[in-house]
Amino acid sequence: AGVFELQIHSFGPGPGPGAPRSPCSARLPCRLFFRVCLKPGLSEEAAESPCALGAALSARGPVYTEQPGAPAPDLPLPDGLLQVPFRDAWPGTFSFIIETWREELGDQIGGPAWSLLARVAGRRRLAAGGPWARDIQRAGAWELRFSYRARCEPPAVGTACTRLCRPRSAPSRCGPGLRPCAPLEDECEAPLVCRAGCSPEHGFCEQPGECRCLEGWTGPLCTVPVSTSSCLSPRGPSSATTGCLVPGPGPCDGNPCANGGSCSETPRSFECTCPRGFYGLRCEVSGVTCADGPCFNGGLCVGGADPDSAYICHCPPGFQGSNCEKRVDRCSLQPCRNGGLCLDLGHALRCRCRAGFAGPRCEHDLDDCAGRACANGGTCVEGGGAHRCSCALGFGGRDCRERADPCAARPCAHGGRCYAHFSGLVCACAPGYMGARCEFPVHPDGASALPAAPPGLRPGDPQRYL
């Protein structure tokens, strides 16, 4: 066990042109804080993947207000170290992500708002117990200077914090086969206590409680010799005496359990027993808890009461991300219906509705004809948020109040002449045409394309359109 320690020295504009604007202003004072995420090995995982070695948040730094006209200086930093405890062996190689966050302290509704200013990442080799390592990383126009180290927590020592030290039993020297513990010369390296029953001849351990087998031996306690002779059973020893084992792809082969988890085979698959602070099918998820305050922007932390359980952040409307760190353009979801205009006011969404629609999301189609009378026998027709009158013959206009000129549309075909009449229009047809709109030619022999003209009317007589 031990602790990874990170000391931030400075965060400010990097060298060269294009210095960033100060993230704080007189109108919007702010302060910084940092988050570190550690993963074992030289992984190139996404920033969102679990911080399997652990994570930590710094305290908030002092409040900073930009001086007008001054270039952005190095910004005031939080006091103290960021410390990430690790329970098991230090892996020696690790990946880190360091995020610089800005907490705005302006007048915005709902108190502080958080935003990510910069994120740096890297992969490093580091032995536990060594000196501070210094580093400089750049993110855009920003530069972060920091130091880090890994140190073992007593009684662990060594480059991986796997050796244990105990106070000397005799004043002069350590017991047989045991070395003094550097740098604690007054203590002695303690023998590791392997898993109970682990074969002293064929097994060994690098961490307390484990039992790793020398080549040629197998079994949980390294008591079963490996043989390549044929077996009755497809996998595993046919009997304790023959010690026959045909290598086969077992679910625990290669130990799928991360972060020091121990693997045990189950009838269907495998099961990982995870060390405290890790969870998940393969012990791949680290133990940031709700007590660490991981939810920003008013997010509520759910679950995660202890390091053995996951937390999730329920984000207020307008924020998303695993820590509610991303602001959402809520209008991009097009919440306003029927062509309404969306306004994101921060504390609420507003929809400005088109005529004929109402409701918080313009979801209600108003009864356009309610209280609307169409004059002169017209009937109201709803549509698209506006009412329309279908007017009786001889009337027009929005409300059918205007007397229409029925001849305006030139309804009489083939040169017929139109006459307005109290009940509509009358077409006087040109010679050779007949019909209400003079649409039918009269045949040369006097027969028409229609049945015979109505009695009392000769072809060519004006015909009233009723």
């Epitope: 709902g110 509520l300 329920h314 207020p316 409307p317 918080p360």
Partner: antibody, heavy 118, light 108 residues
């Protein structure tokens, strides 16, 4: 301004299910999280749970096995069901909207007293 | 869960006096995610303060909130007759959301 109105029976028999509905006006149910809180006579406030229009829910662990909160966006309503009630569930039940800047309660209904008795 | 303890349970005061109500959390409340409510007899609670110190819309400036971590206070600088009520604190840092037991302000 958002207004909330609780409705439902004021008397429920032991072992039955308490059902209440909260009708929201003056705001879209899609804009907020919506919560139920109760207050036994002469006692303090107890959070029951909340729902988001997307269906996300979160319940008080002390009541989780008996509580269901659901939302009906078409009616601008959300509801509470509490099963296997006992006399200890007698309380004034409030519906409330959760603020958009954090999980505190900015608008409350006037409350409805539900008595559990045979 | 975070347990909120309010003290005192009851306070007897006169109009015009200044009063400070305390709310203590069993664990750190991150980001000052703490709210205060007022409940008058027969009414629903009303939001006064959120974010430990921000006044809600329409709340008179005689109400102020302060504190961080585990200790929070609500101060009423000059008591008005309508301020005699029960006051509750509530944390919204983590689930379950929890309320304090309340402090009753009564007229002396």
């Amino acid at each position: 301004q958002v207004q909330l109105q609780e409705s439902g029976p004021g008397l429920v028999k032991p072992s039955e299910t308490l059902s209440l509905t909260c009708t929201v006006s003056g705001g879209s149910i899609s804009s907020y999280y919506w919560s139920w809180i109760r207050q036994p006579p002469g006692k303090g406030l107890e959070w029951i749970g909340y729902v988001y229009y997307s269906g996300t829910t979160n319940y008080n662990p002390s009541l989780k096995s008996r509580v269901t909160i659901s939302v009906d966006t078409s009616k601008n309503q959300f509801s509470l069901k509490l099963s296997s009630v006992t006399a200890a569930d007698t309380a004034v039940y409030y519906c409330a909207s959760i603020a958009v800047t954090g999980f505190y309660f900015d608008y409350w209904g006037q409350g409805t007293l539900v008595t559990v008795s045979s | 869960e975070i347990v909120l303890t309010q003290s005192p349970g009851t306070l007897s005061l006169s109009p015009g006096e200044r009063v400070t109500l305390s709310c203590r959390a069993s664990q750190r409340v991150n980001n000052n995610y703490l709210a205060w409510y007022q409940q008058r007899p027969g009414q629903a609670p009303r939001l006064l303060i959120y974010g430990a110190s921000s006044r809600a819309t329409g709340i008179p400036d005689r109400f102020s909130g302060s504190g961080s971590g585990t200790d929070f206070t609500l101060t009423i600088s000059r008591l008005e007759p309508e301020d005699f009520a029960v006051y509750y604190c509530q944390q919204y840092d983590r689930s379950p959301l929890t309320f304090g037991g309340g402090t009753k302000l009564e007229i002396k």
